[in-house]
């Protein structure tokens, strides 16, 4: 048999070998596709199937607009002028080229030695699904699960049957000062079909610098609270990626899960003390915030105690 590849929506003509070009003809077309459950023999006189597969006067079979459901096998059996039976057998596959792939949500820059999301490559409207590949400086990027991580998702449209592919690339650049170029390409995996490429994105890789500053914000301002009240301590840090944050009270680590927010509900005198947060960055040592004092008072009208946070409610480490 012969393998035929047809573009979705385009017409396809399959010739019936051996069939006389004009009637009278002795021929039979049958098909086994997504529209049938077994073999369907087409009537030479035409009928309801003509909208999807029609026998032409010369004996060929016309598919006016091929669809996904037309994938399958088409066979013609004809008797030629000399009375010999000739068979034609076609295996039809269909395809649809998607729109040009795009890199959405691209990074503005990358930081060396830490995981960075480069962006998400999106291709819409393909059939069959095809594949997305990432390229670095023109060379194919092979995901290794460590320095190069690719997260893929394939969705099929419930009505059209066409595919949308998404591929998210995360990399750990080894050193700063470079300007790598990333691009993404879509391939259907069909012969003679060139891949579709995105516009490349060039990103600067910077060395991971120390966090610009660590701030400890306290609510209520001043750190003075009545018994039974709630205190919220927030450790604000500008580093990327966000570091792990641990908490210290009166010089001792608090046995809590890492979190940038510490909530003290229904405070009592046992919650009084000096609090600070410690941010641990992957490429740097731990960094501690200035301390804040928490005071629990009945009236709440006393001024800030010595060593407590000032009016702004923040302690800042330059």
């Amino acid at each position: 048999g012969q393998n035929i590849t047809a573009r979705i929506g385009e017409p396809l003509v399959l010739s019936c070998k051996g069939a006389p070009k004009k009637p009278p003809q002795q021929l039979e077309w049958k098909l086994n596709t997504g529209r049938t459950e077994a073999w369907k023999v087409l009537s030479p006189q035409g009928g309801p199937w003509d909208s999807v597969a029609r026998i032409l006067p010369n004996g060929s079979l016309l598919l006016p607009a091929t669809g996904i459901v037309d994938e399958g096998t088409f066979r013609c059996r004809a008797t030629n002028r000399r009375g010999k039976e000739v068979k034609s057998n076609y295996r039809v596959r269909v395809y649809q080229i998607p729109g040009k792939p795009e890199i959405v949500d691209p990074a503005s820059e990358l930081t060396a030695s830490v995981p960075n999301k480069v962006g998400t490559c999106v291709s819409e409207g393909s059939y069959p699904a095809g594949t997305l590949s990432w390229h670095l400086d023109g060379k194919l990027l092979i995901p290794d699960g460590k320095e190069t991580l690719v997260k893929e998702e394939t969705r099929r449209h419930p009505e059209t049957g066409l595919f949308t592919l998404r591929s998210e690339l995360t990399v750990i650049p080894t050193q700063g000062g470079t300007h790598p170029t990333f691009s993404c390409s879509f391939s259907l995996g069909l012969p003679r079909r060139r891949p579709l490429n995105t516009a490349p994105i060039q990103l600067r890789v910077r060395e991971p610098g120390p966090p610009e500053g660590i701030q400890l914000l306290v609510e209520p301002e001043g750190g003075i609270v009545a018994p039974g009240g709630t205190v919220t301590l927030t450790c604000a840090i500008s580093a990327q990626p966000p570091p792990q944050v641990h908490w210290i009270k009166d010089g001792a680590p608090l046995p809590l899960a890492p979190s940038p927010v510490l909530l003290l509900p229904e405070v009592g005198h046992e919650d009084e003390g000096t609090y600070s947060c410690v941010a641990t960055h992957p490429s740097h040592g731990p960094q501690e915030s200035p301390p804040v004092s928490i005071r629990v008072t009945e009236t709440g009208d006393e001024g800030p105690a010595e060593g407590s946070v000032g009016e702004s409610g923040l302690g800042t480490l330059a």
């Epitope: 529209r35 049938t36 077994a38 369907k40 035409g46 309801p48 199937w49 003509d50 909208s51």
Partner: antibody, heavy 119, light 107 residues
Framework: EVQLVESGGGLVQPGGSLRLSCAAS????????MTWVRQAPGKGLEWVAS????????YYPDSVKDRFTISRDNAKNSLYLQMNSLRAEDTAVYYC????????????WGQGTLVTVSS | DIQMTQSPSSLSASVGDRVTITCRAS??????VNWFQQKPGKAPRRLIY???NLADGVPSRFSGSRSGTDFTLTISSLQPEDFATYYC?????????FGGGTKVEIK
């Protein structure tokens, strides 16, 4: 809203002619096959004719072949049935319906127009 | 030509009853069968397309099934507005062929 409205029915003598029309609206007319179906008084439904979306191919049962002609004007969103050599047994309500091929069957029908063949 | 033998030709039923109507094709017609409802003086209304699919706006008490060349329309709980005549149609081959109809009457 998808709508089909038939017109042109009436009383005609045996051997006479009549032309039915069907005005379509609410859908892209030239994307669909169209079909005429009839129903004799107190009887069941009978297929009369179908035409493909371009108008190039027409289909009839033996009972009306060579007497009836289905046609369409895609620019006017209109379907027609030219009926010649009418017989008493052609008396029926004639319905225009969208479809007629395997992608659809028949999905939307007009309200029908009555054709009476009698002397 | 394909024959569509519809049974029964009529039936009497009460509101709330489960009603089953069958069409048997004289040869394989695949899934290419529609079911219609027709009320007196009105045009047919499509209920089921391609043997088993419920048409838009049709109540879910209507369903279609197929076993080989046997096609069934089921009304799970008959409602007062369901008293009408029902037809099947095969559209796999020309001539397009309708079943003879089933009149559903109030018992």
């Amino acid at each position: 809203e998808v709508q089909l409205v038939e017109s042109g029915g009436g009383l005609v003598q045996p051997g006479g002619s009549l032309r039915l029309s069907c005005a379509a609206s609410g859908f892209t007319f030239n994307n669909y096959w169209m079909t005429w179906v009839r129903q004799a008084p107190g009887k069941g439904l009978e297929w009369v004719a179908s035409i493909d979306n371009s108008g190039d191919n027409t289909y009839y049962p033996d009972s009306v072949k060579d007497r009836f002609t289905i046609s369409r004007d895609n620019a006017k969103n209109s379907l027609y049935l030219q009926m010649n050599s009418l017989r008493a047994e052609d008396t029926a309500v004639y319905y225009c319906a969208r479809g007629g091929d395997i992608t659809l069957g028949l999905d939307v029908w007009g309200q029908g127009t009555l054709v009476t063949v009698s002397s | 030509d394909i024959q569509m033998t519809q049974s029964p030709s009529s039936l009497s039923a009460s509101v709330g009853d489960r009603v089953t109507i069958t069409c048997r094709a004289s040869q394989d017609v695949g899934i290419y069968v529609n079911w219609f409802q027709q009320k007196p003086g009105k045009a047919p209304r499509r209920l089921i397309y391609r043997a088993t699919n419920l048409a838009d706006g049709v109540p879910s008490r209507f369903s279609g099934s197929r076993s080989g060349t046997d096609f069934t329309l089921t009304i799970s709980s008959l409602q007062p507005e369901d008293f009408a005549t029902y037809y099947c149609l095969e559209f796999d081959e020309h001539p397009l062929t309708f079943g003879g109809g089933t009149k559903v009457e109030i018992k």
